[in-house]
Structures are given as structure tokens and as C-alpha cells.
């Protein structure tokens, strides 16, 4: 029961996490204009992985996609790639984990197969979560670097005519969504891996044996099986002392040539 609960909870947590990763990837507010020490402006700028937006004080917003692919910064391309890999792995993991759920019965799927599938999906969720966290962290690092670079530029070139002052950008909502979602996917993956251990069946290689009190007459059986184990027939056809033990199949006695004497 605990295994089913752990697996189910892991699935739900991962599902929420992957939905969050998708949401974060699609969101426009990865970086937002830093309004601290900024001139009073009627417009507000923010950017996502796919497009840039400008919002007017009235609320009207205009966005434009990054149409060029080659002209984009390598870091942005890397973040895009990490997020997409995270989504793809997460989606495959979800698909695998649906069939792995203990509460869902599909044909005559054995527990060992479900355990393997649970472990596979768990690993996929962990990698997916790590990809999302890495992608968001790379972008955040890029923002921090640019923030301090533009801050430094504010004090350069004061003697000259042109002051190369740049707008500073800070963390957008998408970064926090991405971090939380990546963490949830990671936790869900760990839970799936824990559930896998409970699903894996114990190896049992023994037959059920019923014991009968042995009588005074001791029977010798040609080509008999060792009653204590479920392995290996007596290929050399040696007579084995049965000791009164019979497997369920051997309860019925078979006639021998001595019975007709």
C-alpha cells in the first residue's frame, strides 16, 4: 500500500512539475526591466525565451518573436535546449510511468516489469528536473552578469558626450516558476525510484511441499525428484530415498511391477 502511495504521489508531483516546466518555458517574463533607479517611463519591457514584450502603462502589450536563430546569444540557445530536453524527457517519463502505476492493470504485466518502468520514469523525471533547474540557473546567471555590467557602465564615459547607459533587467516570474517546477519534478523522480524498490518482487525458487507421515514400508522410486527443491530432475536415474515427503503432484501413488506379483 505504501509503495502504491509513494508511486502515485511521485507521479502526481512529477506531473505538476512538468506542467510547471512547460509553463515556465512558454512564459514571456524571464527577464523584467529593473524599475529601481530608472527614469519614470510609460513603458515596461520584459523578455522570454521566444519573444520580447513592451507593455504600456494603459496595459496594452506588444510582443515580437525572435525570428533570427543564428543571431541569438549562445546562452539563450543553450537555455532553450535545456528546457526543451527537460520537457521531452518529462513527457516520456509521464507516458512510461502511467503504464508503470501499480493501481493500473494492463494485461498480465508482471511486477518486475512495472518496477523497471517505474525506475526508468523516475530517472527520466530526475534528469528532466535537473535540465530545468540548470536552464533557469544559466539564464539567471546571465541576468546577474549583465546587471552588474550595465551598473558599471553607468559610471563610465561621463567626461564624453555619449553616456552608454543600459537598461538593467532582473529576475522575471518564469525563473521562479522554473526553479520550483524543476524541484518538484526532481522530487517526483526520487519518489518513483524509491517506489521501484518496493515494487521489485523477491526471488522465490521453491515449490509448495506437503508432508505426510511416512509409513513402515519405505518406497524407492525410480527417477524421482528431490522433494525439498524445485530444481533438476535426476538425469542419472538413481534411486532416491523419498523419506515420506510428497509434492502436491505426487500424492497419488502410481502402480509398479511389484503390485501385480
Amino acid at each position: 500500500m505504501a509503495v502504491t502511495a509513494c508511486q502515485g504521489l511521485g507521479f502526481v508531483v512529477s506531473l505538476i512539475g512538468i506542467a510547471g516546466i512547460i509553463a515556465a518555458t512558454c512564459m514571456d517574463q524571464w527577464s523584467t526591466q529593473d524599475l529601481y533607479n530608472n527614469p519614470v517611463t510609460a513603458v515596461f519591457n520584459y523578455q522570454g525565451l521566444w519573444r520580447s514584450c513592451v507593455r504600456e502603462s494603459s496595459g496594452f502589450t506588444e510582443c515580437r518573436g525572435y525570428f533570427t536563430l543564428l543571431g541569438l546569444p549562445a546562452m539563450l540557445q543553450a537555455v532553450r535546449a535545456l528546457m526543451i530536453v527537460g520537457i521531452v524527457l518529462g513527457a516520456i517519463g509521464l507516458l512510461v510511468s502511467i503504464f508503470a502505476l501499480k493501481c493500473i492493470r494492463i494485461g498480465s504485466m508482471e511486477d518486475s516489469a512495472k518496477a523497471n518502468m517505474t525506475l526508468t520514469s523516475g530517472i527520466m523525471f530526475i534528469v528532466s528536473g535537473l535540465c530545468a533547474i540548470a536552464g533557469v540557473s544559466v539564464f539567471a546567471n546571465m541576468l546577474v552578469t549583465n546587471f552588474w555590467m550595465s551598473t558599471a557602465n553607468m559610471y563610465t564615459g561621463m567626461g564624453g558626450m555619449v553616456q552608454t547607459v543600459q537598461t538593467r533587467y532582473t529576475f522575471g516570474a518564469a525563473l521562479f516558476v522554473g526553479w520550483v517546477a524543476g524541484g518538484l519534478t526532481l522530487i517526483g523522480g526520487v519518489m518513483m525510484c524509491i517506489a521501484c524498490r518496493g515494487l521489485a518482487p523477491e526471488e522465490t525458487n521453491y515449490k509448495a511441499v506437503s508432508y505426510h507421515a511416512s509409513g513402515h514400508s519405505v518406497a524407492y522410486k525410480p527417477g524421482g525428484f528431490k522433494a525439498s527443491t524445485g530444481f533438476g530432475s535426476n538425469t542419472k536415474n538413481k534411486k532416491i530415498y523419498d523419506g515420506g515427503a510428497r509434492t502436491e503432484d505426487e500424492v497419488q501413488s502410481y502402480p509398479s511391477k511389484h503390485d501385480y506379483v
Epitope: Q33, S52, V54, R64, V165
Partner: nanobody, 123 residues
Framework: QVQLVESGGGLVQTGGSLRLSCAAS????????MGWFRQAPGKGLEWVAG????????DYADSVKGRFTIARDNAKNTVYLQMNSLKPEDAAIYYC????????????????WGQGTQVTVSS
Amino acid sequence: QVQLVESGGGLVQTGGSLRLSCAASDSTFSSYIMGWFRQAPGKGLEWVAGITWSGGIKDYADSVKGRFTIARDNAKNTVYLQMNSLKPEDAAIYYCAANAIQLTRRSGDYAYWGQGTQVTVSS
């Protein structure tokens, strides 16, 4: 890389009007936010106005609000600055600038610049 060429500058009387044009060489003109800056003799670069990709959002400096109008024609790859009720303090070299992602008042955000056109206002 987009190349910008300004035109329309000249000498005008106080209270008069001028229309500045900025033609872009790049066919991807519509993917740039455009801005106008000016530099008066012995002064720093001052932002005048800006316009988004399709012209949906326009922003103006307080000193020119109500007198200047920015517009763009993406079919002609051109941005315009209509200047009315000109004052002597409007005399400067006017620069056209382009940037791909943000409508800001800071010169450092603009990647591409024109060579400028002189506007003189006589009293």
C-alpha cells in the same frame, strides 16, 4: 546589420514644423524598435521618442510630449519624427537608432545608429 540614414533636417523658425525621416537598409526593419535621440551643442545625448515593432506603442520625452509625433511605415522601412511648435531648445543633431528587443530611453540599449541630421531653430 541594419544601416540607418536620416533626412529632413534644416533651418526653421520658432513655432515652425519639420518632418525627419530615417530610412533603414534592412528588409527586417519591422523586427526593430526605433528611437530618436538628439544632441545639442555641448550637451549629452538626449532621448526624444521611441516606437515599437508595429507602432502599437509610442513613448515620448516629457520635453516634446504633445509637440512631436513618432510614426513608422514598415512597408517603406522608414520611421518618421513629426516636429511641431519648434522651440530654440529643440535645436540639435537628431539621431535615429534601432534595437531589436526593448523600447527604452537609454542610448546604450540601441545597437544601430544613423549619422544624424542637423535641426536649427531660429528665433
